[in-house]
């Protein structure tokens, strides 16, 4: 209708990075920009994704290098993290959120794809990491190895080999395991502290240089107490599980101190593994019973999990695997390991700013049934799995509903702000829920809409529209872009209108009748009034139309509803040659060129396109007859 198709601004970017996957208009004290997501962008050797800021009128885009943002105290994996897959602008302060839903971190032998987002302030400076699903690794451990280095230990090289082999089994790194070693005999010394080395390679290298210090006495109690009171303090981390491994070959010369030392270790929640090396006893034919009892006393209960004995120093190698496995069985304590909570949640797959924070879709949460998390300045709200059972029953738990594929919110005069989330794979047909979240991690689900067709991906895109700008939502639009009709993936957009407290189905938006795949409804944007009739409007993307070139449809709002026939269809081919997937993302909230009219930003594969609004001239014809 009034969008200019002759002089668009086509902003080029990398196709391989999928520059244009997401677009957002941005205003910094009067200067207008486009923020463009490129979720496959490369940073160095890693395909992290990134976000660009692009000047609206002329000039080149600048990468914000958010892909370089690192989280401390985690062993992160940023490759393929898809930064820019979702963008959400906060119009209050012009900050925005850029999410990396496939950001993952190493936990033991696993990579947990919890996802994370970066908050960027109005002048494009990174300000904060938002990662509500990030939990401490079960391998968040401080391990202190207490080595008997007294004269009777022989040969020392076997102890060294054992030490190196056990260290190689440890997941050493930020947010995971730290290792310190103390050696004792008559005295105790730090070989290295917990925070001296940050990788297996470095720790192994340090361990290979530990020499036997000797000593005629074996002060095991003192060694344990030194580890507890000093080694765990120097470089120890708050909240880390404390693990001590004691390796000794004989009764201690200070065993009367053991009771107090062990009590203090218990009080400090130090889990103790104890290894009795019987070489000295066996070489001399001495009964080791008293020694073994002492080592069992040192080991945490139960003994069968924490106590080891070996015939001699050379046999230490035989317990490496068992000891490693026992320590890491601490990982799964009280956990049903066949089930995932937030470990694979992919938080930030979708995002939406609300008054008191941000909603984040987490499609991988709860075994890919999905969830919506909320991050606020006061903390985070993570609804429990059970909160969703009313609409996501237990019997469908293995179906992977992908709740949180998209998130938005509506405002009703009765209930105020209500959150909306789509689960496009629910029971194969898709579902949308409207709910409120509570700080006790429960939800109240007010309404649910279900898709009609298997595989249609109903709920993969949702937009709420306040047509008349009164602050109350009038229309909720739900996309089912894979809706199959007439032999093609045509797509469908369902219209729901607010009546009292419920959204009532009121037909679908009309698309064009081409006989190719279209995926109409892949993106749906509520935009400010384009045609200057004082009603807000809607733009729908069909990125597969015209042989994947793409198209957008403009629908006008009118008196609290939406006109279901498009007022304008803009195809990529009208704008520029070579555009593909035009319409994969849309945003229209700002006047970008200072002409008083709202302009559109549309994403495509490797491009961002700005479409300028033209003024609408209303001609009121009046007919006068003379003589009357």
């Amino acid at each position: 209708f009034n969008m200019d198709t002759r002089k668009p601004r086509v902003i080029p970017g990398s196709r391989t990075a999928f520059f244009g996957y997401t677009v957002q208009q941005h205003d910094i004290s009067g200067n207008k920009w486009l923020v463009v997501g490129a979720p496959l962008e490369t940073n160095g050797y890693q395909k992290t994704g990134d976000v660009y800021k692009c000047p609206v009128i002329h000039g080149n885009c600048t990468k914000l290098n958010l892909g370089r943002v690192t989280l401390s105290n985690v062993s992160e994996r940023k490759d393929n993290m898809r930064l820019g897959l979702s963008l959400a602008t906060n119009p209050k302060d012009n900050s925005f959120l850029a999410c990396s839903p496939l950001w993952s971190h190493e936990c033991g032998s696993s990579y947990y794809t919890t996802g994370m987002c970066s908050r960027v302030n109005s002048n494009f400076r990174f300000s904060k990491t938002v990662a509500p699903a990030l939990q401490r690794c079960q391998t968040y451990m401080d391990i202190v190895i207490v080595l008997d280095g007294s004269n009777s230990i022989y040969p020392w090289v076997e102890v060294q080999h054992f030490l190196i082999n056990i260290l190689k089994k440890f997941y050493i790194g930020p947010g995971q395991i730290q290792v310190g070693v103390v050696q004792y005999g008559e005295d105790v010394v730090h070989e290295f502290h917990l925070n001296d080395y940050r990788s297996v390679k470095d720790v192994v290298e340090a361990a290979s240089h530990i020499e036997q210090r000797g000593g005629t006495e074996t002060r095991t109690a003192f060694g344990i107490e030194f580890a507890r009171s000093e080694a765990f303090q120097k470089g120890g981390r708050k909240g880390a599980k404390k693990v001590m491994i004691v390796i000794t070959d004989g009764e201690s010369h200070d065993s009367p101190d053991l009771e107090k030392v062990i009590q203090q270790s218990e009080r400090d929640n130090v889990t103790r593994y104890a290894v009795a090396v019987l070489g000295y006893y066996n070489r001399r034919g001495i009964n080791p019973e008293t020694f073994l009892n002492e080592i069992k006393y040192i080991a945490s209960d139960p003994d069968d999990k924490h106590f080891f004995n070996v015939t001699d120093e050379a046999a230490l190698k035989d317990i490496v695997d068992a000891l490693g496995d026992r320590i890491f069985s601490l990982e799964g304590t009280n956990k049903n390991e066949t089930s995932f909570g937030l470990e694979m949640s992919q938080t930030g797959f979708s995002s939406h700013v609300v008054e008191d924070g941000v909603l984040l879709g987490a499609v991988g949460a709860y075994d890919w049934n999905g969830a919506v998390l909320k991050e606020t300045s006061a903390g985070k709200v993570i609804p429990l799995r059970e909160s969703y059972l009313k609409e996501f029953p237990e019997e469908l738990k293995n179906h992977g509903a992908y709740l949180g594929y998209t998130v938005t919110s509506v405002v009703s005069s009765r209930q105020g702000r209500v959150y909306v989330a789509g689960a496009p794979r629910f029971n194969h047909t898709g579902k949308v829920i409207l709910f409120t979240m509570h700080n006790n991690r429960s939800l109240t689900i007010h309404q649910a809409m279900r898709g009609q067709q298997i595989g249609s991906y109903f709920g993969s895109e949702i937009t709420s529209v306040d047509i008349d700008g009164d602050g109350v939502t009038d229309v909720l639009l739900v996309g089912a872009p894979m809706y199959f009709n007439e032999g093609r993936e045509r797509g469908k957009v369902y219209v729901y209108e607010l009546r009292q407290n419920l959204f009532v189905y009121n037909g679908t938006l009309k698309d064009s009748h081409s006989y190719q795949n279209a995926r109409f409804g892949s993106s749906i944007a509520s935009v400010r009034d384009l045609n200057q009739d004082s009603y807000n409007d809607v733009v729908v993307g069909a990125p597969l139309e015209d042989n994947h070139a793409g198209a957008i449809y403009i629908f006008h709002g009118f008196r609290g509803s939406i006109l279901k026939t498009p007022k304008q269809r803009i195809t990529a081919s009208e704008l520029a040659t070579g555009l593909q997937y035009f319409g994969c993302s849309i945003h229209g909230q700002l006047d970008l060129n200072e002409d008083g009219l709202i302009d559109l930003a549309v994403g495509a594969l490797g491009n961002a396109v700005i479409l300028w609004s033209r003024p609408v001239v209303q001609i009121n014809a009046s007919l006068h007859f003379e003589p009357s």
């Epitope: 002060r219 107490e225 010369h253 200070d254 009367p256 053991l258």
Partner: antibody, heavy 120, light 109 residues
Framework: EVQLVESGGGLVQPGGSLRLSCAAS????????IHWVRQAPGKGLEWVAS????????YYADSVKGRFTISADTSKNTAYLQMNSLRAEDTAVYYC?????????????WGQGTLVTVSS | DIQMTQSPSSLSASVGDRVTITCRAS??????VAWYQQKPGKAPKLLIY???DLYSGVPSRFSGSRSGTDFTLTISSLQPEDFATYYC???????????FGQGTKVEIK
């Protein structure tokens, strides 16, 4: 030659204080434990307190807990028993004895004893 | 706390007699039980440690044994210098709390 010599005993009034010393020679206090054991006139042996000179961990019999304090000065190779709030029933010969790994945690050397009399 | 009940409290024997003194622990204990001999006006002397090991310099007529919670000191052939009071002593494992028996006075018959 291993020797333990107690000193500091004497007559004291009820409620009074006394400090006993146990000077060790022929071995290093640092690598052993010192126990104080007492024997009231005509009675059996009663364990009083112990200290690890190395770690400074202490143990006390219930009858003296809160009143007596055991300590050691490894530089002087001497152990001490500070006795406060003394009562008539604390009247006894006080012995110090060595306790260590090499005697399988038995009291292998004893001092000659020092008499403490609590009387008004 | 572990109690050590020593019996008899006194006994009369003749030179050459076999004498047995018993200590019973109130609960299961380690073998860290020692026996001491004390003569009037003197400090106690260690005879037996670890329930059955003879301390150096102690005549071989002294022996110790254990059966469950019962610990026994045996003098195989009583000598004139053996008339004294004997005490058992138990060490609490992994602490330096110790307990003495009440003592057994061995007198000349």
């Amino acid at each position: 030659e291993v020797q333990l010599v107690e000193s500091g005993g004497g007559l004291v009034q009820p409620g009074g204080s006394l400090r006993l010393s146990c000077a060790a020679s022929g071995f290093n206090l640092y690598s052993s434990y010192i126990h104080w054991v007492r024997q009231a006139p005509g009675k059996g042996l009663e364990w009083v307190a112990s200290i690890s000179s190395y770690s400074s961990y202490t143990y006390y019999a219930d009858s003296v807990k809160g009143r007596f304090t055991i300590s050691a000065d490894t530089s002087k190779n001497t152990a001490y028993l500070q006795m406060n709030s003394l009562r008539a029933e604390d009247t006894a010969v006080y012995y110090c004895a060595r306790y260590w790994y090499y005697s399988a945690w038995a009291l292998d050397y004893w001092g000659q004893g020092t008499l403490v009399t609590v009387s008004s | 706390d572990i109690q050590m009940t020593q019996s008899p409290s006194s006994l009369s024997a003749s030179v050459g007699d076999r004498v047995t003194i018993t200590c019973r622990a109130s609960q299961s204990v380690s073998s860290a039980v020692a026996w001491y001999q004390q003569k009037p006006g003197k400090a106690p002397k260690l005879l037996i440690y670890s329930a059955s090991d003879l301390y150096s310099g102690v005549p071989s007529r002294f022996s110790g044994s254990r059966s469950g919670t019962d610990f026994t000191l045996t003098i195989s052939s009583l000598q004139p210098e053996d008339f004294a009071t004997y005490y058992c002593q138990q060490s609490a494992p992994y602490s330096s709390l110790i307990t003495f028996g009440q003592g057994t006075k061995v007198e000349i018959k």
